[in-house]
């Protein structure tokens, strides 16, 4: 997260880290005791999932292995449309005040809505500085029409933009798959942005979760 702040401890109990060994690979969001939602471009063969801590690599955090993941069938490695994936944990998480599932959206929030994005991604760009603490940034949803002025045909129909005019605050490497939460519901998953990160008026681009609720529910049901 560029130009963000340290999240209030315990304020994001649904935030998970997908680790490759001990190294941060992507963020993710707990949606059920067996399931984590993340970005399709974060796919690996297997995952070590850290839950219940704001510190990356926290020894006291829950760590659960995951060997199955389900990319959206319409994900394109070329255009990155449908950048959404469900990761099935090998064992259920122990829910607590530190580990909770996020609320999935009932509706799509409108442009102008205030949201918070979080992650352990680099806080500087192009040179990287990975924080140990979970970082947050407060952003607002941007209309597709406005966002297309910047990204033109790169912006797919189910992509959502967020940012703050003239501000550097944004997501970056390592934040991928992490949550954009608006009015206590999951509205976005970090998908992509321009580089170096934090260029003012280049919004962060997210997968618009409200458009995928049916796919999420059906996939979890099919692979119970």
């Amino acid at each position: 997260i560029i130009d963000g702040y340290k999240c209030k401890e315990g304020s994001h109990p649904w935030q998970v880290a997908l680790l490759k060994g001990n190294q941060l690979h992507c963020g993710g969001v707990l949606v059920d005791k067996y399931w984590v939602l993340t970005a399709a471009h974060c796919k690996m063969g297997q995952y070590q999932v850290q839950l219940g801590s704001d510190k990356i690599g926290d020894q006291s955090a829950q760590k659960i292995k995951a060997t199955k993941s389900f990319r959206h069938p319409g994900y394109s490695t070329k255009t990155h449309v449908n950048d959404i994936m469900l990761v099935r944990l090998d064992e259920p998480v122990k829910m607590s005040s530190k580990v909770e599932a996020v609320q999935l959206p009932e509706h799509c929030e409108p442009p102008g809505t205030s949201c918070t994005v979080s992650g352990w991604g680099t806080t500087t760009s192009p040179d990287v500085t990975f924080p140990s603490d979970l970082m947050c940034s407060d952003v607002k949803l941007i209309s597709s029409r406005e966002c297309k002025k910047v990204y033109k045909d790169l912006l797919g129909k189910t992509m959502l933009c967020a940012g703050i005019p003239d501000s550097k605050t944004n997501t970056c490497n390592g934040d991928s798959g992490g949550p954009l939460v608006c009015n206590d519901t999951l509205q976005g998953l970090v998908s992509w942005g321009t580089y170096p990160c934090g260029q003012p008026n280049d919004p962060g681009v997210y997968t618009q979760v409200c458009k995928y609720k049916r796919w999420v529910m059906e996939t979890m049901k099919t692979h119970r």
Partner: antibody, heavy 127, light 108 residues
Framework: QLQLQESGPGLVKPSETLSLTCTVS??????????WVWIRQPPGKGLEWIGS???????YYSPSLKSRVTISVDTSKNQFSLKLSSVTAADTAVYYC???????????????????WGQGTTVTVSS | DIQMTQSPSSLSASVGDRVTITCRAS??????LNWYQQKPGKAPKLLIY???SLQSGVPSRFSGSGSGTDFTLTISSLQPEDFATYYC??????????FGGGTKVEIK
């Protein structure tokens, strides 16, 4: 300031393996923000991408050369290398190493432009 | 594979001229196109990335435009040091990364 320097034999016999090394100075090869790239240019011709490698040692090769190419990275020496097997006269070229700087992050991290280049090394395939 | 076609393959121009080079992709590559300049015996140099963004240290007389399949590199007022070969390059996902055939800008 980051600099790249290619090294290796200037003359290789047909059917042998061409081996080149690119040494990175003024910066670390261990940055997950960059790709490390090999490109070649036959005499009087245009540029041809050979392949790339990232910090995680994931490799990406030109389909036309894939069966003969190996790119590897040695983070301890701050170097990356190219091996091209079963060479013929058609592999005679100036070989460049370069840094691929991503144009995006996240899902768009794969898109990049080469912003730092070595000066190139001439390799002739001849008996 | 996506083919990149540059035109013209060569052109003659005078100092102070406005020069336009075009690059066409065989299918849409959004704005993932870069332009390079190469002088004889030297390595290429990145001029423009993401179709229209000027690389740091490159003079503002260079500009790029286009999206989808058609792209343009413009030199607003040609300078003596601009006589070189220019290449476009697409990078819309691996593999392969491909270059255009090049445009040689010569002195008239």
């Amino acid at each position: 300031q980051l600099q790249l320097q290619e090294s290796g034999p200037g003359l290789v016999k047909p059917s042998e393996t061409l081996s080149l090394t690119c040494t990175v100075s003024g910066g670390s090869i261990s940055s997950d923000d960059y790709y490390w790239v090999w490109i070649r240019q036959p005499p009087g011709k245009g540029l041809e991408w050979i392949g790339s490698i990232d910090y995680y040692a994931s490799t990406y090769y030109s389909p036309s050369l894939k069966s003969r190419v190996t790119i590897s990275v040695d983070t301890s020496k701050n170097q990356f290398s190219l091996k091209l097997s079963s060479v013929t006269a058609a592999d005679t070229a100036v070989y460049y190493c370069a840094r691929g700087r991503p144009l995006g992050y996240g899902a768009k991290h794969y898109y990049y432009g080469m912003d730092v280049w070595g000066q190139g090394t001439t390799v002739t395939v001849s008996s | 594979d996506i083919q990149m076609t540059q035109s013209p393959s060569s052109l003659s121009a005078s100092v102070g001229d406005r020069v336009t080079i075009t690059c066409r992709a065989s299918q849409s590559i959004s704005s993932y196109l870069n332009w390079y300049q190469q002088k004889p015996g030297k390595a290429p140099k990145l001029l423009i990335y993401s179709a229209s963004s000027l690389q740091s240290g490159v003079p503002s007389r260079f500009s790029g435009s286009g999206s989808g399949t058609d792209f343009t590199l413009t030199i607003s007022s040609l300078q003596p040091e601009d006589f070189a070969t220019y290449y476009c390059q697409q990078s819309p996902y691996f593999p392969p990364l491909t270059f255009g055939g090049g445009t040689k800008v010569e002195i008239k």
